[in-house]
Interface confidence: low
C-alpha cells in the first residue's frame, strides 16, 4: 500500500514560494501566482506547453450547509507533462490538489499505463492544511530508472464516488541502444549467400546500425534499425557483430561465428562389442561433424582371406546411435571393418580399419544314413549313422545329439542323449513297449547344434516281436 505521512496543521502562508515537500526536477519550475480570491491552486508546475487548456477530470463539489454556498470545481493542478532522463538516474515527480476541508480522508493513488501501482513503490502523500483548504502533494520517486519504467503516470482521487484524474506525466528513460534482435551463429555452405539481422531500439531514436566482420566495419554508411546484412558468401570462418548507435552512445552486439560447412572428419575409435558366428556388433566415435549434422553412416566390411575376391560389403545405417550390427557374415572368418559418415556436404574419409572375427558356426548338415534296430534280447534300440560332411566354418565336431520320441496310446515323451564325436552308433533303452520310437540325430560343434536328420521310426512290439527301420537318409551314391 502507498505510505501516507500526515502532518499537523501548520500556519503556512498560501503562496510563500515552494511548499515544503514539493520537489522539482530540471523539467519543472514553480510559478508564483498573484493572490486572488476563491480557491486558487496553492502550487503549480509549468506544463510542457505553457498555456495549454487543462484536460483533467473535474469534480464539482456542492455544500449543502446554510447559505448553500457552491464550491469551485476540484482538479489536479497542472504539472510537468514529460520527463526525459537517462537510465540509472533517479527521478521524483508529483501531483498536487487543493481540497476543501469539508472532504475528509481523501486518498490519492498512482497509476501507470492504466494499472494501479501497488506495493513497494516510493509514493509519499503530504498534507498542508490551512483554514479552508488542504493542499495535498503526492510524490512518486524511482531510483535508478530502467527502460521498464517508461510510461504514462497519473494520480487519481476519489471524492463522493467521483473520480478526479490528473494530467498524465510521461516518463521517457533514454539510454544506449538496446538490442531486440541480435545476429545468430550460423553454419553456411561455402560461397553461398546468407542474411544476418540486427535490431536495436532507443529511446532516443533513431538507432543506426553498423556491421562488423572480423573487427572491420562492413558498411561505411549506417543503416536505420532494423538492418539486414546480406553476405554474398564466405570461403572461411568469420565473426560478425553489429554496432547500434544513438545520441546516447554505442552498444555492440555479441560476436557470432559463421562457420563454413565441410565434409566431416572420419570416425574414430571403431570398437568391437560382440561377435557371433554370423554377426559383429561395432560402435564408433563420430568425428567432427563439419558444422553440418550427420545424415547417415556407411559400414564397410572386407573379408581378410587370400582366397576371397577382395570385394567390399557396404551397410548403410543412421548416424545415431553410433552402433551397428553387421549381419550375414560367414562363420569363423576374419574381416576388416571401417566406418565413414556423411553430412550434407559429403562423405568423410573412412575411419582407421580394424580387424574382427566371427566365431564358429553350427553345422549346416545332418548326419547321414541313420538306421535304427531293435535288439530285443537286450531290450534296447541300436542307432547307427554316418558323420556329416561339415564345412570348416562350422568348427570342430564335438559330438551328436540324439532325440528319441516315444508315442503310445496318445502319450508322447521326448528324450535327448549326447554322445561324443568319435561315435557313429549308440544304444538307447526301450522306454515303452507296444509304442513307436522316432529317432533324429544332429551334429554338435562349439558353434551350436546343427539340423536334425529326418525322423526314423521303429515300432517296439509287445515282447516276442521284432521290427527293423531303414536308414533315414541314404549315403551319397546309394540309390
Amino acid at each position: 500500500a502507498i505510505t501516507e505521512a500526515r502532518e499537523e496543521a501548520k500556519p503556512y502562508p498560501l503562496f510563500p514560494g515552494p511548499l515544503p515537500g514539493s520537489l522539482q526536477t530540471d523539467h519543472t519550475s514553480l510559478l508564483s501566482l498573484p493572490h486572488t480570491s476563491g480557491y486558487q491552486p496553492a502550487l503549480m508546475f509549468s506544463p510542457t506547453q505553457p498555456g495549454r487548456p487543462y484536460t483533467g477530470n473535474v469534480a464539482i463539489p456542492r455544500v449543502t450547509s446554510a447559505g448553500s454556498k457552491l464550491l469551485p470545481p476540484l482538479a489536479f493542478k497542472h504539472t510537468v507533462g514529460h520527463i526525459i532522463l537517462s537510465e540509472h538516474k533517479d527521478v521524483k515527480f508529483n501531483c498536487s490538489i487543493s481540497v476543501p476541508n469539508i472532504y475528509q480522508d481523501t486518498t490519492i493513488s498512482w497509476w501507470k499505463d492504466g494499472k494501479e501501482l501497488l506495493g513497494a513503490h516510493h509514493a509519499i502523500t503530504q498534507f498542508y492544511p490551512d483554514d479552508e483548504v488542504t493542499a495535498i502533494i503526492a510524490s512518486f520517486s524511482i531510483t535508478s530508472v530502467q527502460r521498464s519504467d517508461n510510461g504514462s503516470y497519473i494520480c487519481k482521487m476519489k471524492i463522493n464516488n467521483e473520480e478526479i484524474v490528473s494530467d498524465p506525466i510521461y516518463i521517457e528513460v533514454q539510454g544506449l541502444p538496446h538490442f531486440t534482435k541480435q545476429p545468430e551463429s550460423m553454419n553456411v555452405t561455402r560461397n553461398t549467400a546468407f542474411n544476418l539481422t540486427c535490431q536495436a531500439v532507443g529511446p532516443p531514436e533513431p538507432v543506426n546500425i553498423f556491421w562488423v566482420q572480423n573487427s572491420s566495419r562492413v558498411n561505411e554508411q549506417p543503416e536505420k534499425s532494423p538492418s539486414v546484412l546480406t553476405v554474398p558468401g564466405l570461403t572461411e570462418m568469420a565473426v560478425f557483430s553489429c554496432e547500434a548507435h544513438n545520441d546516447k552512445g554505442l552498444t555492440v552486439s555479441k560476436g557470432v561465428q559463421i562457420n563454413i560447412k565441410a565434409i566431416p572428419s572420419p570416425p574414430t575409435e571403431v570398437s568391437i562389442h560382440n561377435s557371433t558366428a554370423h554377426s559383429i556388433l561395432i560402435s564408433w566415435v563420430p568425428g567432427f561433424d563439419g558444422y553440418s549434422p550427420f545424415r547417415n553412416c556407411s559400414v564397410q566390411v572386407k573379408e581378410v582371406d587370400p582366397l576371397s575376391n577382395g570385394s567390399v560389403m557396404i551397410f548403410n545405417t543412421s548416424a545415431s546411435p553410433h552402433m551397428y550390427q553387421i549381419k550375414q557374415l560367414q562363420a569363423l572368418a576374419n574381416y576388416s571393418i571401417g566406418v565413414s559418415c556423411m553430412n550434407e556436404i559429403g562423405w568423410s574419409a573412412v575411419s582407421p580399419w580394424i580387424l574382427a572375427s566371427t566365431t564358429e558356426g553350427a553345422p549346416s548338415v545332418a548326419p547321414l544314413n541313420v538306421t535304427v534296430f531293435l535288439n530285443e534280447s537286450r531290450d534296447n534300440v541300436d542307432i547307427r549313422w554316418m558323420k556329416p560332411l561339415t564345412k570348416r566354418q562350422a568348427g570342430e565336431l564335438v559330438g551328436y545329439r540324439i532325440s528319441h520320441v516315444w508315442q503310445s496310446a496318445g502319450i508322447s515323451k521326448e528324450l535327448l542323449e549326447e554322445v561324443g564325436q568319435n561315435n557313429s552308433r549308440a544304444q538307447i533303452s526301450v522306454q515303452v513297449h507296444n509304442a513307436t520310437c522316432t529317432v533324429r540325430i544332429a551334429a554338435v560343434t562349439k558353434g551350436g547344434v546343427g539340423p536334425f536328420s529326418d525322423p526314423v521310426k521303429i515300432f517296439i512290439p509287445a515282447h516276442g516281436w521284432v521290427d527293423h527301420a531303414p536308414s533315414s537318409t541314404p549315403a551319397p551314391g546309394n540309390a
Epitope: N187, V239, Q257, S265, T268, F288, D289, Y291
Partner: antibody, heavy 122, light 106 residues
Framework: QIQLVQSGPELKKPGETVKISCKAS????????MSWVKQAPGKGLQWMGW????????TYTDDFKGRFAFSLEASASTAFLQINNLKNEDTSTYFC???????????????WGTGTTVTVSS | DIQMTQSPSSLFASLGGKVIITCKSS??????ISWYQHKPGKGPRLLIH???SLQPGIPLRFSGSGSGRDYSFSISNLEPEDIATYFC????????FGAGTKLELK
Amino acid sequence: QIQLVQSGPELKKPGETVKISCKASGYTFTAYGMSWVKQAPGKGLQWMGWINTYSGVPTYTDDFKGRFAFSLEASASTAFLQINNLKNEDTSTYFCARRAAVVAKYWYFDVWGTGTTVTVSS
Amino acid sequence: DIQMTQSPSSLFASLGGKVIITCKSSQDINKRISWYQHKPGKGPRLLIHSTSSLQPGIPLRFSGSGSGRDYSFSISNLEPEDIATYFCLQYDNLLTFGAGTKLELK
C-alpha cells in the same frame, strides 16, 4: 591415443600467481572445448568454466569470475589456467577436461587430465 | 543451479557382487547425466553418458538407467579393478557433479 597431460604440483604463497598447463594429444585440439574443474581437499568437483579452443573465448562460472583466467597456446595444443592473488582456499587439485560434443548445446566430459595439485600456504 | 544428491557416499562390496549408486537431481534433467570412475593419481574416466549409453571400450558390467530426477548406475560381477570413486555429472543446465561414492572391498 587421446590424452591430456597436466603440469606438475605447485606450492605457492598467498598473494602469488600460479599458471598450470594442460597439453592435449591424439586429437584435433581446436575442435573440442576445454573445461577446468576444481576439487578442493575432501570436497566435491566444481565446474569452473570453459574456453573455446577455436576462438580463445573463455566463459567462467559465477564462482570463478575475477582472479581466474583461461588461455591457450593453440599451436602447442595447450590450455592454461592462471590464478592470481592466490588464497588459502585455492588449495585444490585442478583438472582439465575435454568436452565430448564438438557442436552441441548439451555436453559432458569424455577425456580428463590427471590433475594438478596447487597448495597455497604461507 | 541444479543440485545433484549422490548416495551412498561410501560402499563396501564383494568381488563378483553387484553395486548400485544413485543420483537425484533438484529438477528434471531430461536424461542428461554421465557417470565417471576416478582412481587416485589418475584423471576421471567416462563410463556412461546420456543416462545409459556405454562409452566404447567400457565393459558391459557397467550400466545406467533413470529419467526425470532419479538416476542409477550399477556394476555387476564386481572385479578388483572396479575399486574406485564414482561420480555423476548433470549437463542439462550448466554442469553440476554428484559428491562421489567411494567403492571399497568388503
